[in-house]
């Protein structure tokens, strides 16, 4: 079950809930946002203060790390299995250091399996964080510091920090190095969403959340 099911069961307060893998008894803890846009959102990534190191291994990105109370990555394997069952939408919420907020909404999102390096698939972009997708299209394979699957001769994850769907290296990286205010410009290895804030701006906060399209 996911946060949408939990919401529909009557638990409509945002917080940490135990989710289960599809067709399995395996459990995972996640933050459920029951407030934004009608609720039912499973948060798969959150950055807010730099308290968690996002330069992690393939295994850690597969299984998840951090704390759902703060900064965390839910885990590629769970997200892949979940989004392979039904059609999901992806909402990405962004905050800059000047108090502005923006979002990108994709009307269809799924991750391929590990055998395809958790390649991201996205369609139907709307929102205020750029008219062009800052996640390269068509989707790229996921790369980490110990698993280089990008389209660059270089190793984007090693160079730019964090696991992400790097292209060469691509116009985004929400898992980049966290830079505090006044140190967040001209930082190519920061938390980047190019088509909102440009080439070298590192964001203050990000949230990636998913929900069934038919919610």
């Amino acid at each position: 079950r996911d946060c949408a099911e939990i919401f529909k069961s009557g638990l409509t307060t945002s917080g940490i809930y135990t989710l289960t893998f599809p067709n399995s008894t395996e459990e995972i803890k996640a933050y459920c946002d029951m407030d934004v846009g009608g609720g039912g959102w499973t948060v798969i990534q959150h950055r807010e203060d730099g308290s968690v190191d996002f330069q992690r291994t393939w295994k850690e990105y597969k299984e998840g790390f951090g704390s759902p109370l703060g900064e965390y990555w839910l885990g590629n394997e769970f997200v892949s299995q979940l989004t392979g069952q039904h059609r999901y939408v992806l909402k990405i919420q962004l905050k800059d250091w000047e108090g502005n907020e923006a979002h990108s909404l994709y009307d269809h999102f799924y991750l391929a399996g590990e055998e395809s390096n958790y390649r991201i698939h996205l369609t139907g972009l709307t929102g205020t964080a750029g008219k062009i997708s800052s996640i390269s299209q068509p989707g790229s394979d996921f790369s980490t510091k110990d698993s280089d699957n990008d389209k660059c001769i270089c190793k984007c994850s090693q160079m730019l920090s964090g696991g992400w769907w790097f292209d060469a290296c691509g116009p985004s990286n929400l898992n980049g190095q966290y830079y505090p205010q006044k140190q967040n410009t001209n930082k190519f290895n920061g938390i980047k969403w190019y088509y909102w804030k440009g080439s070298g701006y590192s964001l203050k906060a990000t949230t990636m959340m998913i929900r069934p399209a038919d919610f």
């Epitope: 660059c152 090693q158 160079m159 730019l160 292209d167 691509g170 116009p171 080439s199």
Partner: antibody
Framework: EVQLLESGGGLVQPGGSLRLSCAAS????????MSWVRQAPGKGLEWVSV????????YYADSVKGRFTISRDNSKNTLYLQLNSLRAEDTAVYYC???????????????WGQGTLVTVSS | DIQMTQSPSSVSASVGDRVTITCRAS??????LAWYQQKPGKAPKLLIY???SLQSGVPSRFSGSGSGTDFTLTISTLQPEDFATYYC?????????FGGGTKVEIK
């Protein structure tokens, strides 16, 4: 095979203008930041300018700011450098350069053209 | 602007020698440094990026190290084709700047 072919160099008088072109092939041009680097005769390398994949972000060395303009046409796989108000100190071989990544704020050049010579003299 | 200072400006060496070239930045550039090789009349060639990452196709006798302000390019066993001029370049901040070059000559 990646190829970068510059053209447009030549002899020009001080105060004059030139437009350099760089035809790119062998890679997905629209996915990479592109740069111009120059080298005066017998001297070292000097970075001139870089442009983002979309062309929306451009940066210049102080020595050419306000005089040179970098641009690109992704439909033609071509990079340009417009040189105006040329000075004797602009005399150099101008290299078209493919960046290792698409990150305009981090220039590592992994492929270079053969260079085109610009001579500014009266 | 960040100034990049290479030393020595030239070095005489023999085939088989170990050659070390240093590059110093005027301020902290973390690991955002590249090394290039240039032969007379030719375009430069990328050897090392991000201080120590070997560019694809470059022989393993070339290696880079350092971070912050002090960097080193080492050629472990000099080959005849390695006689050239070597440049460092910082990629930390605009404007991107090169060192003055180190010419490796035949002794």
């Amino acid at each position: 095979e990646v190829q970068l072919l510059e053209s447009g160099g030549g002899l020009v008088q001080p105060g004059g203008s030139l437009r350099l072109s760089c035809a790119a092939s062998g890679f997905t041009f629209r996915k990479y930041a592109m740069s111009w680097v120059r080298q005066a005769p017998g001297k070292g390398l000097e970075w001139v300018s870089v442009i983002s994949v979309s062309g929306g972000n451009t940066y210049y060395a102080d020595s050419v700011k306000g005089r040179f303009t970098i641009s690109r046409d992704n439909s033609k796989n071509t990079l340009y450098l417009q040189l105006n108000s040329l000075r004797a100190e602009d005399t150099a071989v101008y290299y078209c350069a493919k960046d290792l990544t698409d990150i305009v704020l981090m220039v590592y050049v992994d492929y270079w053209g053969q260079g085109t010579l610009v001579t500014v003299s009266s | 602007d960040i100034q990049m200072t290479q030393s020595p400006s030239s070095v005489s060496a023999s085939v088989g020698d170990r050659v070390t070239i240093t590059c110093r930045a005027s301020q902290d550039i973390d690991r955002w440094l590249a090394w290039y090789q240039q032969k007379p009349g030719k375009a430069p060639k990328l050897l090392i990026y991000a201080a120590s990452s070997l560019q694809s196709g470059v022989p393993s006798r070339f290696s880079g190290s350092g971070s912050g302000t002090d960097f080193t390019l080492t050629i472990s066993t000099l080959q005849p084709e390695d006689f050239a001029t070597y440049y460092c370049q910082q990629a930390n901040s605009l404007p991107f700047t090169f060192g003055g070059g180190t010419k490796v000559e035949i002794k």
